[in-house]
């Protein structure tokens, strides 16, 4: 048994890092590997985790840490029962993928302005809190060529469009994912999407 | 120069409890109490994260010592709780910038655990 693709982790930088590898043939990852982790800090103990199939020879872990600071250093050891497969180290900081953002509400009822919020996925005392821009992505279900990108740069988690930009009459979909320019993370997933009814009054026109 | 002063050290009786406290001159990733009991080797007691929520124990002291900071007076506390004979040593504050925590060392407060 050899690990084919070395462990890769990436960091939510909060409570939770995901490490995937893949093994050089089928593999029931939970039954036959442990990957133990262990921060680099004085009197901290080993955890270990029980991966789970991610494809066939492909394995994901997904590390329970109580919080996560800048200086954090992982070590990493992948076990097939006594026998090790891999040594590593991880330091999230330098791995961040921001959790998703949540709670994607579109306001139709001012006037002709579309208001989409969202709710920001850390808790205020987390450093990610004050520093996620987000991207909001808006489509239209009826046209595949109406696709259209927003970027949020700064740091109140909503949107204020004029829905007149949009199509009159037809159903949108929205969806909104986060990356820290700080740590320059990878962008989060994306949030689950929600739909609405674009209307809104023509203006009238004087001939 | 960083500086570390410890306090509260003393004489207490078996069960008793005691309060050390050391100030530190900045701030720091790791921040931890060792102990050296005669004629023994130094051996970490407690250690803190930055941000002040990830705590560490030795087996010896689990339960009974608690370590805290205060991270706007970048002080550390170490309440000591059940004190027993064997807790008997003189106690360090140490810092560090890596999880090492052995950069800087305090002058030492001396604990005795005696009826």
């Known amino acids: 048994m050899k690990v084919l693709q070395e462990p890769t982790c990436v960091s939510d930088y909060m409570s939770i890092s995901t490490c995937e590898w893949k093994m050089n043939g089928p593999t029931n990852c939970s039954t036959e590997l442990r990957l133990l982790y262990q921060l680099v800090f004085l009197l901290s103990e080993a955890h270990t985790c029980i991966p789970e199939n991610n494809g066939g020879a492909g394995c994901v872990c997904h590390l329970l840490m109580d919080d996560v600071v800048s200086a954090d250093n992982y070590t990493l050891d992948l076990w097939a029962g006594q026998q090790l497969l891999w040594k590593g180290s991880f330091k999230p900081s330098e791995h961040v993928k921001p959790r998703a953002p949540g709670n994607l509400t579109v306001h139709t009822n001012v006037s002709d302005t579309l208001l989409l919020t969202w709710s920001n996925p850390y808790p205020p005392d987390n450093y990610l809190y004050n520093h996620l821009t987000y991207a909001v992505n808006i489509w239209s279900e009826n046209d595949p060529a109406d696709f259209r990108i927003y970027n949020v740069t700064y740091l109140e988690p909503s949107l204020r469009i004029a829905a007149s930009t949009l199509k009159s009459g037809i159903s949108y979909r929205a969806r909104v994912r986060a990356w820290a320019q700080c740590y320059n993370t990878t962008w989060s997933e994306w949030s689950p999407s929600t739909k609405w009814h674009n209307s809104y009054r023509e203006p009238f026109e004087q001939h | 120069q960083v500086q570390l002063v410890e306090s509260g050290g003393g004489l207490v009786q078996p069960g008793g409890s005691l309060r050390l406290s050391c100030a530190a001159s900045g701030d720091f990733y790791c921040m931890a109490w060792f102990r050296q009991a005669p004629g023994k080797e130094r051996e970490a007691v407690a250690a803190?994260?930055?941000?002040?929520?990830?705590?560490y124990y030795a087996d010896s002291v689990k339960g009974r010592f608690t370590i805290s900071r205060d991270n706007s007076k970048n002080t550390l506390y170490l309440q000591m709780n059940s004190l027993k004979a064997e807790d008997t040593a003189v106690y360090y504050c140490?810092?560090?910038?890596?999880?090492?925590?052995?950069?800087?060392w305090g002058q030492g407060t001396l604990v005795t655990v005696s009826s």
């Open positions: 140490a810092v560090g910038v890596d999880g090492n925590c052995r950069n800087y």
């Open positions: 803190i994260r930055s941000g002040g929520r990830s705590t």
